[in-house]
Interface confidence: low
């Protein structure tokens, strides 16, 4: 009598997550009497996947009709495969006993699961940074298999090179995660810029997944301040203008001070956007020169996006001014801070 053979023809099978996996097994004889069982893994810790004699295994079905007595095909199909199903599966013939006695095992079939990476999630810095500073963006994607994966960063279509990427875990696993950090140098023109994290994987069939982040969430463009005086009006009133330009985000508070005393406070709202995404704002203050005996020190104080206030001052010389319209006055600039605030006197 020839020796019983348990044949598992495929050494490995690769299946996409969500699909069904067919694990083939045939036996050379139905003798001796006893069940066929499928296990994942070998040794004492192996997991019973299917018992062709009895039991309830909702995701597993027999490939061929096991009710036919001449059936020697004990292949199974596992539905709705997930990465957790990866492993080596063994078709094992038992001789009926108490307990059943293992007779012969197939060589095993390694099931690997091709799982798509999750949509990349890009997160930016917790606080805004100003132009000429470098900020970090992080991209994460999870649950993919096999481990090989490609991740690229782009800023406005140009690939970034200052990138650090890690795939975890380093060893064998049912699925993997990728985390990548890109360092991006901000410029004042980056309000409309975008960074893209692009993930390519064998499961995506050449159509990479993309995650995006807008630099508008990460950048702060501080304003330029310029205070100027218009010509003296006939009613001895001087119109002083504070021009706040090229700032982002819009959150801005402007306060006028006359000789250090608050004259008026305004909040920027519903401003038109410049082409580069920044905003401009102009505020006017009418100063009645005849009401002052001494020079008037006007200060335009701007608080932008919760940052320390930036001042621009202007002195209206009362003693020197003639009554006629168009006469000159002297101006004084003070209080510029370390930011790039450029402003001339009027």
């Amino acid at each position: 009598e020839e020796e019983l053979q348990v044949i598992q023809p495929e050494k490995s099978v690769s299946v996409a997550a969500g699909d069904s996996a067919t694990l083939n097994c045939t036996v050379s004889s139905l003798i001796p009497v006893g069940p066929i069982q499928w296990f994942r893994g070998a040794g004492p810790g192996r997991e019973l996947i299917y018992n062709l004699k009895e039991g309830h295994f909702p995701r597993v079905t027999a490939v061929s009709d096991p009710t036919k007595r001449n059936n020697m095909d004990f292949s199974i199909r596992i539905s709705n495969i997930t990465p957790a199903d990866a492993g080596t599966y063994y078709c094992v013939k038992f001789r009926k006993g108490s307990p059943d006695v293992e007779l012969k095992s197939g060589a095993g079939t390694e099931l690997s699961v091709r799982a798509k990476p999750s949509a990349p999630v890009v997160s930016g810095p917790a606080v805004r940074a100003t132009a000429e500073h470098t900020v970090s963006f992080t991209c994460e994607s999870h649950g993919f298999s096999p481990r090989d994966i490609t991740l690229k960063w782009f800023k406005n279509g140009n690939e970034l090179s200052d990138v650090q990427t890690n795939v975890d875990p380093a060893g064998k696993s049912v699925s993997y995660s990728i985390r990548s950090t890109a360092r991006v140098l901000l410029t004042r023109r980056d309000v409309h810029s975008q960074v893209i994290c692009e993930v390519a994987h064998v499961t995506l069939q050449g159509d990479p997944l993309r995650g995006t982040a807008n630099l508008s969430e990460a950048i702060r463009v501080p304003p330029f301040l310029e205070v100027t005086q218009q010509s003296m009006r006939a009613d001895n009133q001087v119109n002083v203008t504070c021009q706040v330009t090229k700032f982002y985000p819009q959150r801005l508070q402007l306060t006028w001070l006359e000789n250090g005393n608050v004259s008026r406070t305004e909040m920027a709202s519903a401003l038109p956007e410049n082409k580069d995404g920044t905003y401009n704002w102009t505020s006017w203050l009418l100063v009645n020169v005849s009401a002052h005996r001494d020079d008037v020190k006007l200060t335009c104080q701007v608080e932008h996006d919760g940052q320390p206030a930036v001042n621009k001052s202007f002195s209206v010389k009362v003693s020197a001014h003639p009554k006629e319209q168009g006469s000159n006055t002297a101006a004084e600039n003070t209080g510029t801070n370390e930011r790039n605030i450029y402003g001339g006197s009027g």
Partner: antibody, heavy 118, light 107 residues
Framework: EVQLVESGGGLVQPGGSLRLSCAAS????????MHWVRQAPGKGLEWVSA???????YYTGSVKGRFTISRENAKNSLYLQMNSLRADDTAVYYC????????????WGQGTMVTVSS | DIQMTQSPSSLSASVGDRVTITCRAS??????LAWFQQKPGKAPKSLIY???SLHSGVPSKFSGSGSGTDFTLTISSLQPEDFATYYC?????????FGQGTKLEIK
């Protein structure tokens, strides 16, 4: 609940015909081998016919050429067309489901009586 | 066809008794043997398949054994509801065949 309900039995003259039906509920009939088993009054069980999941059919020698087993998947029903009936076909006819793995009978219907008499 | 022979044809026993019914096949049927219980006027009930495996819901007082040609059904402790007719059946090849039955009666 998994259930088999037979119908169609009755009194028929020798040489006549009868069609037995078996309505399955709680499972998909086409996924199982299905059988007809009969029992003459006061006698033992006799396997009559089977239909496999692939549509293959089997008969005991005494009914070959006279009985036809079939199923209608859309109605989840099994049938036994009995022609050229004889007195020795008189019996209670049971519809039976074969088990998933080895065709061991697991579910039986309540039976329907067929009487062949003039 | 494979012939199935049961013995005894009838058996008297008392509540609490342990009884054994045997079934012999005319040729090797591996372990493709089933046992059924039938009460008067009722459909048979499946008890055991593949010679020794209990169907769902069947109490463990029923047990089967055997392989090849000789099989047994044992009821460990008879209860009043166990008095019935028992049939064995081979299902290794068509035509499937039954034993003639064993009538278990109360003594």
């Amino acid at each position: 609940e998994v259930q088999l309900v037979e119908s169609g039995g009755g009194l028929v003259q020798p040489g006549g015909s009868l069609r037995l039906s078996c309505a399955a509920s709680g499972f998909t009939l086409s996924s199982y081998d299905m059988h007809w088993v009969r029992q003459a009054p006061g006698k033992g069980l006799e396997w009559v016919s089977a239909i496999g999941t692939a549509g293959d059919t089997y008969y005991t020698g005494s009914v070959k050429g006279r009985f036809t087993i079939s199923r209608e998947n859309a109605k989840n029903s099994l049938y036994l067309q009995m022609n050229s009936l004889r007195a020795d076909d008189t019996a209670v006819y049971y519809c039976v489901r074969g088990g998933v793995w080895d065709d061991a009978f697991d579910i039986w219907g309540q039976g329907t009586m067929v009487t062949v008499s003039s | 066809d494979i012939q199935m022979t049961q013995s005894p044809s009838s058996l008297s026993a008392s509540v609490g008794d342990r009884v054994t019914i045997t079934c012999r096949a005319s040729q090797d049927i591996n372990n493709y043997l089933a046992w059924f219980q039938q009460k008067p006027g009722k459909a048979p009930k499946s008890l055991i398949y593949t010679a020794s495996s209990l169907h769902s819901g069947v109490p463990s007082k029923f047990s089967g054994s055997g392989s090849g040609t000789d099989f047994t059904l044992t009821i460990s402790s008879l209860q009043p509801e166990d008095f019935a007719t028992y049939y064995c059946q081979q299902y290794v090849s068509y035509p499937y065949t039954f034993g003639q039955g064993t009538k278990l009666e109360i003594k």
